[in-house]
């Protein structure tokens, strides 16, 4: 039996949640991925990737951005401008047929509180530096940035194939499979 352990993230309003969801690339590289919030027994899909997944092709739904890296078996999730009401339990989802449930672990428990986050609009202390010289730059030597694709928010959907961040459970060695009911 593998325990589903939550990872708790605490943020102030206005900050950005930034997490990764690992998946078995040989199984799920070409699958659609989604980000869902657990609202009672009904998981609510907030955003999902397109099919087939493409590297460096972000999908944006409101404040949520998903970037799938099928070459690396990684889904990057960002939720910007966090609000208190965003608090809750989140999971990454492999968006497949409901009966093909593969359970991974490490759901995200997000706690957003009011207060100064040092985000835009906050006042900063004046600096007391004596000297400062011109700026230098370092570059990330990665793929060129592509503007995120904006997607219209679809109605909430439900799914059962849960793939949450962390390492994949090898189903041949798992005795307890968690099955999430489907609601139509």
């Amino acid at each position: 039996t593998t325990e589903l352990t939550e990872e708790k993230y605490e943020y102030k309003e206005g900050q950005t949640l930034e997490v990764k969801c690992d998946y078995a690339l040989e199984k799920y590289a070409n699958s659609r991925k989604a980000w869902q919030k657990m609202e009672g027994k009904m998981p609510k899909i907030l955003a999902k990737t397109e099919r087939p997944s493409e590297n460096s092709h972000p999908v944006q739904v409101g404040r949520i951005t998903l970037e799938d890296y099928p070459d690396h078996g990684l889904l990057q999730v960002r939720m910007t401008n966090l609000q208190v009401e965003d608090s809750g339990l989140y999971q990454c989802v492999i968006y497949q047929h409901p009966k093909e449930s593969h359970v991974l672990f490490n759901p995200i428990c997000l706690v957003v509180t009011k207060g100064s986050s040092g985000t835009p609009g906050s006042s900063e202390n004046s600096t007391q530096n004596v000297y400062r010289t011109p700026s230098t730059t370092a570059k990330a030597l990665g793929p060129r940035y592509t503007s995120p694709r904006t997607v219209t928010q679809a109605p909430p959907e439900s799914t059962v194939v849960v793939s949450t961040p962390g390492s994949e459970i090898n189903l041949t060695n798992v005795t307890d499979i968690i099955r999430v009911p489907v609601f139509n």
């Epitope: 990872e7 950005t16 997490v19 969801c21 690339l25 460096s56 970037e67 960002r78 986050s117 990665g142």
Partner: antibody
Framework: QVQLVQSGAEVKKPGASVKVSCKAS????????IHWVRQAPGQGLEWMGW????????NYAQKFQGWVTMTRDTSISTAYMELSRLTSDDTAVYYC??????????????WGQGTLVTVSS | SYELTQPPSVSVSPGQTASITCSGD??????VCWYQLKPGQSPILVIY???KRPSGIPERFSGSKSGNTAILTISGTQAMDEADYYC????????FGGGTKLTVLG
């Protein structure tokens, strides 16, 4: 407690390869990415890539693609970084580092002690 | 490619406040962390998630953000704080800023 212990200093000739090891202890090795970062003399920190110990998959910075290889041996909780076709520009201290959490790529909360690689003819 | 820009050097008198900036495109939507690096030592994480301090890091270290600029502030700077400081973010790949050498005068 979490520890990352790296192999000792190396002196290599130009054109040769070097393989640096990073032995992890104090946590479940498979659960966290291992990153490799280097610092050349007088230069800043440079991220080389990450290794997912669970799958063995790696993601390399574009600069290093084709001449760096990151692998692991889960039986001894050790990650490896091999750099080929060395030049004098590769003289640097090489660090391994571990993610703070299973569900993030940054920050790097734990670091190895560093391995000095000197490339000289 | 993604870039993070830092001033190469900042100087401050003991007991004063030092501020080191790090700017980059869309940095306001990225989680920023900061590392301290002293000669002959491994980097130390001093700030993560924009403004959180790992255990063991003194309270005089704080982080904040204004727009697409992250700021590491060291209040009541001490001689032992003299070091190189690097910001870091994740945008497809991991990127470090160019580093800022903090000099404590006197």
């Amino acid at each position: 407690q979490v520890q990352l212990v790296q192999s000792g200093a190396e002196v290599k000739k130009p054109g040769a390869s070097v393989k640096v090891s990073c032995k992890a202890s104090g946590y479940t090795f498979n659960g966290y990415y291992i990153h490799w970062v280097r610092q050349a003399p007088g230069q800043g920190l440079e991220w080389m890539g990450w290794l997912n110990p669970n799958s063995g998959g790696a993601n390399y910075a574009q600069k290093f693609q084709g001449w760096v290889t990151m692998t692991r041996d889960t039986s001894i909780s050790t990650a490896y970084m091999e750099l080929s076709r060395l030049t004098s520009d590769d003289t640097a201290v090489y660090y391994c580092a571990r993610d703070q959490r299973k569900t993030t790529v940054t920050p790097f909360e734990y670091w190895g002690q560093g391995t000095l690689v000197t490339v000289s003819s | 490619s993604y870039e993070l820009t830092q001033p190469p050097s900042v100087s401050v008198s003991p007991g004063q406040t030092a501020s080191i900036t790090c700017s980059g495109d869309k940095l306001g939507e990225r989680n920023v962390c900061w590392y301290q690096l002293k000669p002959g030592q491994s980097p130390i994480l001093v700030i993560y998630q924009d403004n959180k301090r790992p255990s063991g890091i003194p309270e005089r270290f704080s982080g904040s953000k204004s727009g697409n600029t992250a700021i590491l502030t060291i209040s009541g700077t001490q001689a032992m704080d003299e070091a190189d400081y690097y910001c870091q973010a994740w945008d497809r790949n991991v990127v470090f800023g160019g580093g800022t050498k903090l000099t404590v005068l006197g």
